[in-house]
Structures are given as C-alpha cells and as structure tokens.
C-alpha cells in the first residue's frame, strides 16, 4: 500500500489554540483501517472519518480542534496490510505560543536586610525567551535571557516579586512571590506539667508563631520560687515540644518557664508555671507485729514508725493486710498502732502484714505474722513459723 501524509511538510508549526487537520492518503488497498499515531501511541478520535477517492484510494483525516503544547510531537498514519503494519513518513508538529513557565519565583522568608535569590525560567517555542523582573509594580532591570536569577541585597518589609516572559508570540506573567520578613518567635503557650514524681517532672507546651523561621530549640528554666535562683535550665531540640526534668528534690515547690528560639534568636519567656514534686514514700516497715487473742477476736499490735527524713512528711495511717488459706482476704486502714481483727475464720491459718503510709503511698510491708488455727496467738516471723503461747 502506498501511504503518505498529504499537504504536510516534514515540520509543521502551528500557533497555540489553532486547529490542525492532517490528511493521510492510502493507495492500493480496498478497505484500509487508517490509524493515527502520535509519538508511538495510537490517537483515539472516533469522530474523525476517512473518505474514498476511488475504490483503491482513501484519505483519512486527523483533526485537532485547538492545539496546545501537549499536542506537539511526531505524527504518522498507519494501516494493516497482509498482517504487516505500514507506516507513513512522520510529520513533526510544533506548537508555538506565549512563553510557558517551567520555574516560577517561590515565596520566601528572610531575615531583615539579608541577601536572597529568586529564579524564573520560561520556554517557547518560539525561542528566544527573555525575562523581565518586577518588584511590586516597578520593573527592575532590563530583559535577561531565560533562565534568570534575581539577586536581591535585602528587604526591610514584606515585598512582592514576579517575572514576565517575552517571545515573538507575546508575554506571560508568572505567579507573584511574596518575600516575608523573618522575626523572633512568639512565646510558647499552654505549658503543662504532664507527669510528676518525687524527683522528675514531664513538661509539654505549644509553640508560638515561629516568626517564619524554623524553631531550633526551646529552653526550660526551673527555679524554686518565681524569679528566684535558677535551679535548672534544659535546652531541648524541637519538635517534639516536651521535656523531662530530672533530679528534682522531693516534696518541693518549683516554678518553670519556657522560651523557644529560631535562627534570629529566642522568644520572650512564657509566664511562670508553679508545680510541686511528690514526697518520698515511707522508708521503714513497722516492727514487732504481734497478735493477742481475746474472746471477741484478735488484737494486732506493732511499733510506731518514726519518719527517717523530713521529705517523708507526716506518717499514717497504717494499712493492714491479711489472708487465709481458704482464700479469704481483706485490707484494713487504722490510725494508731493497734487493730481489732474481725471477720476471719479461727479454724484457718491467718497471715497478717502491716505498712505505714503517707501522701505518696505505703512503705515496705512488715515481716508477715502467722496466726495458726491451732495457736492461741501468733508471733512475727517467716510465713512457715508457728508459735504457741
């Protein structure tokens, strides 16, 4: 089959938005199925027909209603003939239009009076493309070939920049880039002490506005009274906006405040936030736990625990825990050093322990006291010991 693109030169240049009709002539075939191909891919175009000039001569059409840059490329027509595909000579379609931006100026944030650069690039066809820069409504400098880099020595306020690209088809304007001034960050807020123990405190906060410069770190300052001597200062990288304060003194009033810094410097400190570490749990177990059996039940007695350190705070009440081998168990809270035990089964062995508590919690348990079902009373000792009286 004779296949050729009619009325089309090897290169076809069309303006953007204009229609194009490519004609393909097929001779020597009675029933060709003409396909159009662009850059190797078949072009689906159901409303494009082809016409018979004679029984063995057909013309197919590819109509492009309104060409754009994406239509540019290499076109050819092809037919199947005897199981083989015959292809025509290609035509290169070039779509000309106003410049098309491949790089546009981006928004920036810069320190006051610091130098910076903006980039702009546009392409044709047609070439050449020249670039003109605008600062606000003022043109800066003459036309420069694309691509173009604008060097700015610095700004003292937020300023808008754009570029304009020119070629023989006209001009195109880029997006407007806003160059913002960087500033010191704002103070953090919502500062909370999230976890407290006797010697540690976890702190979390929300960062204030970053001043259009990345926050680099935050400082947590701790004192024992607002405005007093600094006890601790911790510098933490951010994010996350959290900090663990270690080695604090138990049962102590503290205050903390936070500030954050970007490349330009630190924010103001946030307001002081008071907190108090927890005290220590009692360090000693009650001693000499013993039992006295009476007609009405069982009386338990032990020695009073004296605080070893002021940080333990006031001690009391005492907590008594007992269990029997039938599975019965209970806890009892008493203010003094003597307790009357009821509700237990005298026919079963009884194990009793006692501890002293304070605001933090209970101290260590005493040695367990075993009251045997066969005993008239019990004595402090290991769980297996059974003592008669």
């Amino acid at each position: 089959a004779g296949l050729k693109l009619m009325g089309a030169p090897v290169k076809l240049t069309v303006s953007q938005g204009q229609p194009v009709k490519l004609n393909c002539s097929v001779e020597g075939m009675e029933e060709p199925d003409i396909q159009w191909v662009k850059d190797g891919a078949v072009v689906q175009n159901l409303d494009q027909l082809y016409i018979p000039v004679s029984e063995q001569h057909w013309i197919g059409f590819l109509s492009l209603k309104s060409v754009e840059r994406s239509d540019a490329g290499r076109y050819w027509c092809q037919v199947e003939d005897g199981g083989e595909t015959e292809i025509s000579q290609p035509v290169w379609l070039t779509v000309e239009g106003v410049p098309f931006f491949t790089v546009e100026p981006k928004d920036l944030a810069v320190p006051p009076n610091a130098p910076f650069q903006l980039s702009c690039e546009a392409v044709g066809p047609p070439e050449p493309v020249t670039i003109v820069w605008w600062r606000g409504t003022t043109k800066i400098g003459g036309p420069a070939p694309s691509p173009s880099v604008l060097n700015v020595t610095g700004v003292t306020q937020s300023t808008m920049f754009s570029c304009e690209a020119h070629n023989l088809k006209g001009l195109a304007s880029s997006r407007t880039a806003t160059v913002h001034l960087q500033a010191l960050p704002a103070a953090p807020f919502n500062i909370t002490v999230t976890k407290l123990s006797s010697s540690n405190a976890s702190v979390a906060w929300m960062p204030g506005a970053d001043g259009r410069a990345l926050l680099q770190s935050c400082t947590v300052q701790v004192t024992q009274a607002p405005g007093g001597w600094e006890v601790l200062a911790v510098v933490v990288p951010v994010p996350p906006f959290t900090c663990l304060l270690r080695d604090l003194v138990p049962a102590t009033n503290y205050s903390l405040r936070v500030r954050c810094a970007n490349a330009l410097g630190p924010s103001p400190y946030a307001d002081w936030v008071p907190f108090q570490t927890k005290g220590l749990a009692p360090a000693s177990a009650p001693q000499n736990l013993h039992a006295i059996r009476t007609d009405s039940g069982l009386i338990l007695e032990w020695e009073e625990v004296i605080p070893e350190a002021p940080l333990e705070g006031p001690l009391g009440p005492y907590k008594l825990s007992w269990v029997q081998d039938n599975g019965t168990q209970d806890e009892l809270t008493v203010e003094g050093t003597r307790a009357n035990l009821t509700g237990w089964d005298p026919q079963k062995d009884l194990i009793v322990r006692v501890c002293v508590s304070n605001a933090v919690g209970c101290g260590p348990w005493s040695q367990p006291l075993v009251v045997s079902s066969h005993d008239r009373a019990g004595q402090q000792g290991p769980p297996h010991s059974r003592t008669s009286w």
């Epitope: 199925d33 159901l46 027909l49 016409i51 018979p52 013309i59 109509s63 309104s66």
Partner: antibody, heavy 125, light 108 residues
C-alpha cells in the same frame, strides 16, 4: 440514494436474546462508519457504540460495553446490534446512523449522516 | 464517565434568537455536533465540527464554541424549529461518543 432499512419492531421477555439489523443500500458498504443510538420512551439520545466499515473495528460506550455486541456482514451490507440477555430497561427505540465524509472536487471533506427509521424493542414479562 | 450538560428547556417568541448551550470538560479540545429531533421523527444533524452547517440546513442555524461551552444559535427562530436539540461530542480520551441530555426548544 442512500437508504438504511432497519428490522421491524419486536417484543421479547426478559432474559431472551435478540438481534436487530440495519441494511444499507446506495453506497459501498465498507465506506462507512455506523453507530447505534438508543432512545428510551420520552428520554434523550444515548450513543451505544460504533463499527467502522474497513476492518469492522468496534467501539462501545461505557454503559453498553459487555451488554451488547455490534457486528456487520459485508456481503449483505448489514450492521447488527445483538443482546444475549434482555432486560426490561432495554425497552427503547434503536436507531442506526451512517456517518460519511466525502469530497466535492477538493480535499476538504463535507460531513453527512443518514439515520435509519428506528427499531422499537419492547422487553416485558 | 464523560457528560455533556444542556439546559432542559429554552423558550423564545417567533423571530427572536434562541441560544442552546452545551458544556463539557473536553470541549476545548473536541468538536461539538448538534442534532434536531422533531416529535416522532429520527434526529437530523444540523451542525458539525462546532460551527459547520450541514447542507440543506437553513442559515439561521449556527454554532460556536468557546472553552468548555458549545452553543447552538437559531437567529430568528421559526415555529417549525420547535424540537428537541442534542449536542454530541467525543469523550476526553477520544474513545467513545456522548450525547447531551437534550434541550426542548419552544417557539411560542
């Protein structure tokens, strides 16, 4: 003169198969593209699909792909629209349409269309 | 799937200009065709490739296209122009055709 003659009206039950035809005369049958168009009672036109004379290449609308088959017999210059299993929603008038471009002396084509009179298909239990 | 949107109805007095619109995302790149269908008859193509009039169609029928909108204009509408009008075009990918929903033109 170009003429498209369509098969007569038909009544079928749901699940039945059916083939309707469109016979062309007055031109070389392979010099055509034929589309099938559906029009439900009181509704608009819907493009079902198309068959191209040379090589009988077919294209279908998304709603009709897999539900109907378009074919042609060159020896009798007839195009067909076939259903394997009809549904009540297939009740409609079906038109065949011949598309043609031809030149009058030059290479600028003029566009013509010929519509068949339509075939009314009723699917009812 | 691709859709073409038309107003359901347009009314004009005899001699006035009727404009029927058709919108579709692919219309900047694909041609629009316009059909006229009178009651009980098969449709007739009146405009092809946006603005080309089929031979035998009165000159008062014209077509245009801008962006995603194609328009059929009937300048000095006649009572006999009362009909349903359908736009028709190619899908975005070019692999199937689509009709608009149709516009009923009333010439009062």
């Amino acid at each position: 003169e170009v003429q498209l003659v369509q098969s007569g009206a038909d009544v079928k039950k749901p699940g039945a198969s059916l083939t309707i035809s469109c016979q062309a005369s007055g031109y070389t049958f392979t010099d055509y593209w034929i589309s099938w168009v559906r029009q439900k009672p009181g509704k608009g036109l819907e493009w079902m699909g198309q068959i191209r004379g040379p090589a009988s290449a077919t294209h279908y609308g998304p709603s009709f792909q897999g539900h109907v088959t378009i074919s042609a017999d060159r020896s009798t210059a007839t195009a067909y629209l076939q259903w394997r299993s009809l549904e009540a929603s297939d009740t409609a008038m079906y038109y065949c349409v011949r598309h043609q471009q031809q030149t009058s002396g030059g290479t600028i084509p003029e566009y013509y269309q010929h519509w068949g009179p339509g075939t009314l298909v009723t699917v009812s239990s | 799937s691709y859709e073409l949107t038309q107003p359901p109805s347009v009314s004009v007095s005899p001699g006035q200009t009727a404009r029927i619109t058709c919108s579709g995302d692919a219309l900047p790149k694909k041609y629009a065709y316009w059909y006229q269908q009178k009651s009980g008859q098969a449709p007739v193509l009146v405009i092809y490739e946006d603005k080309k009039r089929i031979s035998g169609i009165p000159e008062r029928f014209s077509g245009s296209s801008s962006g995603t909108m194609a328009t059929l204009t009937i300048s000095g509408a006649q009572v006999e122009d009362e009909a349903d009008y359908y736009c028709y075009s190619t899908s975005t990918g070019g692999n199937y055709m689509v009709f608009g929903g149709g516009t009923k033109l009333t010439v009062l």
